[in-house]
């Protein structure tokens, strides 16, 4: 059976500006020309979509204008960046890859990246 394996880091720490980046890599069982990458957030047993983008192999990954995600692609590797994160957004972020075209369709799901977000301490007032 041809399976599609998806690899992503286990843990990532967001920057003080609330930006987290990680690589999502997939082993393609076929020669896909169109790929969809989705970032899912799993909290308890609820899974929600954070962002999604479809790209043609060899072209750039394009998220919607209002998306909190950006990314670049290189072969079977996608570099994902999620911005605007706050402490309450700490959780498991799953990379889902779908080979959309040509058929057959293939689904691949990573084990998830635990993203830790720490809200920056407010700057103390200065007495000058």
């Amino acid at each position: 059976c041809k399976a599609m394996h998806v690899a992503q880091p286990a843990v990532v720490l967001a920057s003080s500006r609330g930006i987290a980046s990680f690589v999502c890599e997939y082993a393609s069982p076929g020669k896909a020309t169109e790929v969809r990458v989705t970032v899912l957030r799993q909290a308890d047993s609820q899974v929600t979509e954070v962002c999604a983008a479809t790209y043609m192999m060899g072209n750039e990954l394009t998220f919607l204008d209002d998306s909190i995600c950006t990314g670049t692609s290189s072969g079977n590797q996608v570099n994902l960046t999620i911005q605007g994160l706050r402490a309450m957004d700490t959780g498991l972020y799953i990379c889902k890859v779908e080979l959309m075209y040509p058929p057959p369709y293939y689904l691949g799901i990573g084990n998830g990246t635990q993203i830790y977000v720490i809200d920056p301490e407010p700057c103390p007032d200065s007495d000058f």
């Epitope: 059976c1 041809k2 399976a3 599609m4 394996h5 169109e34 969809r36 989705t38 899912l40 899974v47 929600t48 979509e49 999604a52 479809t54 799953i94 889902k96 779908e98 959309m100 075209y101 058929p103 057959p104 369709y105 293939y106 689904l107 691949g108 799901i109």
Partner: antibody, heavy 109, light 102 residues
Framework: GVVQPGRSLRLSCVAS????????IHWVRQAPGKGLEWVAV????????DYADSVKGRFTISRDNSKNTLYLQMNSLRAEDTAVYYC???????????WGQGTLVTVSS | SPGTLSLSPGERATLSCRAS???????LAWYQQKPGQAPRLLIY???SRATGIPDSFSGSGSGTDFTLTISRLEPEDFALYYC?????????FGPGTKVDIK
Amino acid sequence: GVVQPGRSLRLSCVASGFIFSSHGIHWVRQAPGKGLEWVAVIWYDGRNKDYADSVKGRFTISRDNSKNTLYLQMNSLRAEDTAVYYCARVAPLGPLDYWGQGTLVTVSS
Amino acid sequence: SPGTLSLSPGERATLSCRASQSISSNFLAWYQQKPGQAPRLLIYRPSSRATGIPDSFSGSGSGTDFTLTISRLEPEDFALYYCQQYGTSPFTFGPGTKVDIK
């Protein structure tokens, strides 16, 4: 509905309560007293589709995301297409998590 | 398999699903169907319970052999059960197992 062999029929499935365009949607059928048979799937913006061999070339799946509606155009119907047809939503992690109540299609002369 | 499982309420039910080839990344789901109703998702990949499914239902397995276990049968659990692979098209269903009252 009841339709004669060789004729056509279009099924529709209206969804609500979720962001329709963010999910793939399947058609699954069940002949009387038989098991579930996958028929077709359509993904997201409607450009990518896949069909079971038994319906390829006869059935066409489509969707209108502005109307939250899924369609199945069935042409050249045969007696063996008689079944209850279900639409089902693809969950974020892949299985079919919500199913319509089903529509009975009877192909008979 | 088997096609029909005849058991009594309170008993343990073990249903098996065997694939002809290894299932991609264990993308296997189990559905329950009662007469006149649409199927309902129970378990996916292959041991996560769907929302609202009691913990008496559990799934296990990998590769080609998968199992759905109902630890203690309640009257409402007597129904038809189907497995399905959803990792690649075509998205095939198993033939189904009927769990009926002995």
